[in-house]
Amino acid sequence: VPRWRQQWSGPGTTKRFPETVLARCVKYTEIHPEMRHVDCQSVWDAFKGAFISKHPCNITEEDYQPLMKLGTQTVPCNKILLWSRIKDLAHQFTQVQRDMFTLEDTLLGYLADDLTWCGEFNTSKINYQSCPDWRKDCSNNPVSVFWKTVSRRFAEAACDVVHVMLNGSRSKIFDKNSTFGSVEVHNLQPEKVQTLEAWVIHGGREDSRDLCQDPTIKELESIISKRNIQFSCKNIYRPDKFLQCVKNPEDSSCTSEI
């Protein structure tokens, strides 16, 4: 008789999750010499230990501490790029501007990017059928708690001028409920972070509006200013040209507004 299994509203653990995490870890440590000391088997064991045999709606940041410790990584604190709802462009940017880092350019972010995982209470099984959805089931699920934990630490580590890429095509350019709006903004350290500079990425070719005047950007400005961090905002009217100019800053067309 098949054992009863909890049905959750979200997709199940990504296929070949253990193999994927291990392979990503090996690849990352080969590419990044400063992380060559990392033992990927230990990293997987710590990752697994955070959620296996635990109720997938009762995961805490504490569960991830062994993994956080193993994945400790120093990134230049003044080279951090945050993003919200525009991951692909942010990643394209850091692939070109190699001295800047998104969370997914760090070991822990790279390991988990685009993956889903959860376990079951009191069994050592990984649940490949379904995992809790943040809205419909519970917020303290393995994936959400992981991203909350690593995002908080990433924001806490930032200094000087921190950049954030925001999607100007969305109805809420700044969304208080996003990871950026609910976690990262509130964990920037005012004694270390001088300025948060928002880059609002335009979607339409002919969109010449100043999206820095959007009410949600004003809301972000207010939150940041209350924390005694300076705020700055730039419109990126042409993201394609923006990336091109990052690649070739000497190009004569790159002096005009992008």
Partner: antibody
Framework: QIQLVQSGSELKKPGASVKVSCKAS????????MNWVRQAPGQGLEWMGW????????TYADDFKGRFVFSLDTSVSTAYLQISSLKAEDTAVYYC?????????WGQGTLVTVSS | DIVLTQSPASLAVSPGQRATITCRTS??????????MHWYQQKPGQPPKLLIY???NLESGVPARFSGSGSRTDFTLTINPVEANDTANYYC?????????FGQGTKVEIK
């Protein structure tokens, strides 16, 4: 290029007030906070505090709460330091210095002498 | 407040030799692997000039003869080789914790 240009030397009597200016050029003043640093004759450097040039909110180190006021006039890209009820021990060179927490850009300094 | 103690208070070095200044802090100035310790050079009648930021990063335009190292509570500024125009006062400064604080300074003279 980025420059911070301060007002000239001042000779003041005890009890008077002085206002030192720091004009920023080569960048947008409101993008970076402005710090003030004091150096008494033959002495080391003391951080007095900073002003958030975006919101205008000042932060003072404990030893500089009370008689010291940081202010701004963004229309002329200038930060100000005002000292009231001057005392002989306020005699020093006062520097403005641009953020971040390490100061890559400094004004040339303003010597304030308090003497009767 | 974090107290910064520099040593020595002064030193005399011959041109071509190495000068080493240390700065010890009363508590760690590290955060997530970054050390918030900075070094300045000040010549008479001039404002301080940033040499090294965050313990080991050479400020743009500063000669590679200057280098910084250290972490947590112990930091070093090295000038190697020393040149005649390196005569100046040198200060360390932390920005890990408000209020920012400076060391008392080290006077470097060239023999």
């Amino acid at each position: 290029q980025i420059q911070l240009v301060q007002s000239g030397s001042e000779l003041k009597k005890p009890g008077a007030s002085v206002k030192v200016s720091c004009k920023a050029s080569g960048y947008n003043l409101t993008n970076y906070g402005m710090n003030w640093v004091r150096q008494a004759p033959g002495q080391g450097l003391e951080w007095m505090g900073w002003i958030n040039t975006y919101t205008g909110e000042p932060t003072y180190a404990d030893d500089f709460k009370g008689r010291f006021v940081f202010s701004l006039d963004t229309s002329v890209s200038t930060a100000y330091l005002q000292i009231s009820s001057l005392k002989a021990e306020d005699t020093a060179v006062y520097y403005c210095a641009r953020y971040p927490g390490w100061f890559a850009y400094w004004g040339q300094g303003t010597l304030v002498t308090v003497s009767s | 407040d974090i107290v910064l103690t520099q040593s020595p208070a002064s030193l005399a070095v011959s041109p071509g030799q190495r000068a080493t200044i240390t700065c010890r802090t009363s508590e760690s100035v590290d955060s997530y692997g970054n050390s918030f310790m900075h070094w300045y050079q000040q010549k008479p009648g001039q404002p301080p000039k940033l040499l090294i930021y965050r313990a080991s990063n050479l400020e743009s335009g500063v000669p590679a003869r200057f280098s910084g190292s250290g972490s947590r509570t112990d930091f070093t500024l090295t000038i190697n080789p020393v040149e005649a125009n390196d005569t100046a006062n040198y200060y360390c400064q932390q920005s890990n914790e408000d209020p920012w604080t400076f060391g008392q300074g080290t006077k470097v003279e060239i023999k």
